[in-house]
Interface confidence: low
């Protein structure tokens, strides 16, 4: 557990008066329909709020939307609906906010049935002004900004055309017809799939994958017989139909599709799916669905090439394609991921990995907590976390797990303590060491958010009744103060704070309901006066991440290095501030066999860290052997785990083997065995 010096709760002095002076109410002068909120830029304080109200009439739907803008983090809002000519905005496209601090915003308007194309409103000055533009097509998707140049936009039309703009939506050009899916890659490259015959659905598995690197002047076909494609980190993935049957396999490219390698993953049938759970420039977590409607599959982790995969976790819970998985990247500590497995008795259990999928374990039972009715042994059980799947099942879980990169080690989640996830009302638990240890933070379900890089945690009870109380903690959830932010309770709909957890402002959204009318209302609370002073050197303490055994010289070594962080003391009530940068000191570890994965054709026997040559290649390993690229079949049995920085120590070099000799199969004709397809 991270350092917590004082066990008893220190109260924040005079906090009621300080917060009352910094609580700002705004009542929105329109009827309650739906509301969407977007932050424009980082540290700008600009928020756009779009309220929409639908009245279904007999013949048509009358819609009204209003646009509001704040430039002080939500303390005050100005109605700017006139800037968009009081046009009804289509909420399904949301507000397309430009990357970084470009200040760009695109709103897509509702247009009458007979019009030639759609209409957008564009702003490039953080929504101070908007320009109306009529489109030569009806958009099917939200406008997508190029990550490299926010003037470049792409969109698909309802006619399946791929449209591109080079001047932030002023002028549009259709660069290709019959397009199913389009995505920006790096360097303003666009990848897209096209159909030749009937439609996207009819041609699924017979699509072509195209690339343009010059916004549509020239094209290259980089794949055929494509089912779908995806981008993750520096990897481009395509699922490709097999020649012989209705199965498909994953192929990987690291050069924008110029060359492809077959991934050493099982092929999947029509009813199954692949899903990229997480990817970075080093590696990828891939889920491969099991045959049949099981609701689970297997997680594989890749090598640095995205080609060789190690089985990471069996029976990984993931409902049908596009369904629910609890897979969560714990962004507050390197290498940590949480997910759920479906056990043999069909209960759902939470698993955690601290080493990027190398090993998975149950979450440690929080101290001073009782095992619930799911536990066979009352004294031995673990914490199980509610995430997307529980939310989809309409359990009493208002929020998914929360972690922030700049709030080091902090993870907040709803959970239950037993042998499996329970459907009874969950409590909120917190970890301050990236998931190694947990404590019950709040009784019952809550909404929660992290402010000031972890200096403040704010929570609101999840209730069907109107509320007027907010809870906050300045010591990472150990002690809580409550503040009544309004005399008149509101029906709470959401907490909003600036993404990145650097802000000290929180907005509480809801509506008031009287006999005849209901109105949106927001309360923005600024905690700056609670954290009166800036943090100094004495407010921080050194914390070694991933520490489990301080006596061990290698303590804290994960993926070949350890990291010491400067962390705010729990007893310090001060501001990290908007410019706070996480201070960490890495140190390289000696290599051990744990720093290597087994290359293709080798495996680790249970409870052994050595890689042993597979006696024979079967199933998808044999297919990879037959159809994989020649250079991937020469190996010494080990490969460094992606992202592992260890040096010295063990160097597990075995003799180099040419696995092509093992590529034989009775099921395939001899001429196939000699072919090497890329």
């Amino acid at each position: 557990s991270a350092p917590g010096e004082d066990e008893e709760c220190g109260r924040v002095r005079d906090f009621v008066a300080k917060l009352a002076n910094n609580t700002h109410q705004h009542v929105f002068d329109d009827l309650r329909g739906s509301v969407s909120l977007s932050w424009v830029g980082d540290s700008t304080g600009v928020i756009l709020v779009l309220t929409t109200f639908h009245v279904p009439l007999v013949i048509m739907t009358f819609g009204q939307s209003k646009l509001y803008r704040s430039e002080d983090y939500g303390k005050n809002f100005k109605d700017i609906t006139d800037l968009i000519n009081n046009t009804f905005i289509r909420t399904e496209f949301g507000m397309a906010i430009g990357p970084e601090n470009s200040g760009k915003v695109v709103l897509t308007a509702e247009v009458s049935g007979g019009s030639r194309g759609g209409r957008i409103f564009r702003s490039s000055d953080f929504a101070k002004n908007f320009v109306q533009t009529d489109l030569p097509f009806h958009p099917l998707t939200q406008m997508m900004y190029s990550p490299q140049n926010s003037d470049y936009l792409l969109a698909l039309s309802t006619e399946n055309g791929l449209w591109v703009s080079k001047n932030f939506g002023g002028k549009w050009e259709e660069i290709h017809k019959a397009v199913c899916l389009a995505k920006w890659g790096s360097d303003n490259t666009i990848f897209f799939t096209t159909y030749a015959n009937g439609s996207c659905k009819a041609d699924l598995g017979a699509l072509e994958l195209w690339r343009t690197s010059d916004l549509g002047k020239s094209f290259k076909t980089i794949g055929v017989k494509i089912y779908s494609f995806g981008l993750g980190g520096r990897f481009l993935f395509a699922s490709v139909m097999a020649d012989k049957d209705t199965t498909r396999r994953i192929h990987v490219s690291t050069d924008q599709g110029d060359t492809w390698s077959m991934a050493q993953l099982p092929s999947v049938g029509q009813e199954q799916f692949y899903s990229i759970l997480a990817a970075n420039d080093d590696m990828v977590f891939m889920h491969v669905d099991e045959p049949g409607d099981t609701g689970f599959g297997t997680i594989f982790t890749s090598d640095d090439r995205g080609i060789v995969y190690s089985k990471s976790l069996d029976r990984h819970l993931y409902t049908t394609t596009g369904g629910e998985t609890d897979f969560t990247n714990v962004t507050s500590l390197r290498g940590v991921y949480i997910t759920s497995v479906l056990s043999e008795d069909n209960s759902i259990q939470t698993m955690i990995t601290f080493d990027q999928g190398g090993r998975w374990t149950h979450l440690r039972k929080p101290e001073n907590s009782e095992c619930d009715a799911t536990a066979k042994n009352k004294n031995e059980c673990s914490l199980h976390i509610h995430a997307s799947y529980s939310i989809s099942q309409k359990l009493n879980v208002p929020m998914a797990p929360l972690s922030e990169p700049n709030a080091v080690g902090i993870v907040i989640a709803h959970g239950s303590v037993g042998d499996a996830i329970s459907v009874m009302v969950p409590d909120v638990y917190i970890s301050d060491d990236g998931g190694y240890s947990w404590t019950k933070m709040l009784e019952g379900p809550h909404y929660y958010t992290i402010l000031d890089s972890g200096g403040i945690i704010v929570a609101i009870e999840h209730s069907s009744r109107p509320i007027n109380v907010i809870k906050f903690s300045t010591d990472e959830g150990q002690c809580w103060q409550t503040y009544t932010f309004t005399r008149d309770p509101i029906y709470f709909t959401g907490l909003a704070s600036e993404p990145g957890a650097r802000s000290m402002n929180i907005s509480i959204w809801g509506f008031t309901e009287s006999f005849l009318t209901s109105q949106w209302v927001s309360y923005t609370i600024d905690f700056k006066d609670i954290l009166e002073r800036n943090c100094e050197e004495k407010d921080y303490t050194i914390w070694l991440a991933h520490s489990t055994d301080p006596e061990d010289y290698e303590d804290g070594c994960i993926l070949g290095y350890k990291e010491q962080f400067l962390r705010l003391r729990k007893s310090s009530v001060c501001q990290n501030g908007r410019d706070y940068v996480v201070t960490k000191q890495p140190s390289i570890c000696l290599c051990s066999l744990e720093d290597f994965l087994c290359d293709f054709g080798a495996y680790r026997p249970e409870n052994d860290s050595k890689c042993v040559e597979q006696p024979e290649l079967k199933g998808h390993d044999l297919e990879f052997c037959l159809y994989g690229r020649e250079e991937h079949l020469t190996t010494n049995g080990y490969r460094k785990i992606p992202g592992d920085k260890c040096q010295g120590g063990v160097n597990p070099v075995r003799e180099v083997k040419d696995l092509k000799k093992k590529c034989t199969s009775n099921f395939l004709s001899p001429e196939k065995q000699n072919s090497k397809s890329n």
Epitope: T374, A375, Q393
Partner: antibody, heavy 129, light 107 residues
């Protein structure tokens, strides 16, 4: 074998309270929740609520909120259901049933809910003046 | 609360024939549905859980199907001991609720 044994029949006057017990045996008492279901003469089944034997937390149907109290005694592996302010329409057979709903078994494999797999023999409660 | 509606209220079938019982939910209950059999003077007995999985010791002539809002219990060849009242029950959202029951009687 797994069984639930309930207390005997009761006759009560309107306005009184009744407390029915249900003793579990043959399995780990704290490993499963317990539901209570009642059935009025000639009528269907009506779920009253559920109790978690570990912490004693409960969830009641709205209809019985304020009148029903479910408790448990882990030392004797017994759950209790007390219904107060009795009226004639509370005349029914009251069943306890082992309910694994505490384990959120998974939906995707279409086996999310295990069903109430073991039932008590029922306790007849008659409310009459 | 979720309302469960069973039909028909009474089903007259000859021994050896097939019986099909329906259960409809007022909103989706996914697969969180169980079927019970109850004979006069006895406690209900679990037949099917998870909409389609037979409980331990239940003969193969009982089968359940459906998902979402429409569910079916089928008894492929009625035996004399199968004449009883059958209830469906959802456990998707609290409170758990039962259907009104279908009485299967001898024709």
């Amino acid at each position: 074998q797994v069984q639930l044994v309930q207390s005997g029949a009761e006759v009560k006057k309107p306005g009184a309270s009744v407390k029915v017990s249900c003793k579990a045996s043959g399995y780990t008492f704290t490993s499963r929740y317990m539901s209570w279901v009642r059935q009025a003469p000639g009528q269907g089944l009506e779920w009253m609520g559920i109790i978690n034997p570990v912490g004693g937390s409960t969830s009641y149907a709205q209809k019985f909120q304020g009148r029903v109290t479910m408790t448990r005694d882990t030392s004797t592996s017994t759950v209790y259901m007390e219904l107060s302010s009795l009226r004639s329409e509370d005349t029914a057979v009251y069943y306890c049933a082992r309910d694994p709903s505490g384990i959120a078994a998974a939906g995707p494999a279409s086996r999310y809910y295990y069903g109430m797999d073991v039932w008590g023999q029922g306790t007849t409660v008659t409310v009459s003046s | 609360e979720i309302v469960m509606t069973q039909s028909p209220a009474t089903l007259s079938v000859s021994p050896g024939e097939r019986a099909t019982l329906s259960c409809r939910a007022s909103q989706s209950v996914s697969s969180n549905l169980a079927w019970y059999q109850q004979k006069p003077g006895q406690a209900p007995r679990l037949l099917i859980y998870g909409a389609s999985t037979r409980a331990t010791g239940i003969p193969a002539r009982f089968s359940g199907s459906g998902s979402g809002t429409e569910f079916t219990l089928t008894i492929s060849s009625l035996q004399s001991e199968d004449f009883a009242v059958y209830y469906c029950q959802q456990a998707r959202l609290g409170p758990w609720t039962f259907g009104g029951g279908t009485k299967v009687e001898i024709k």
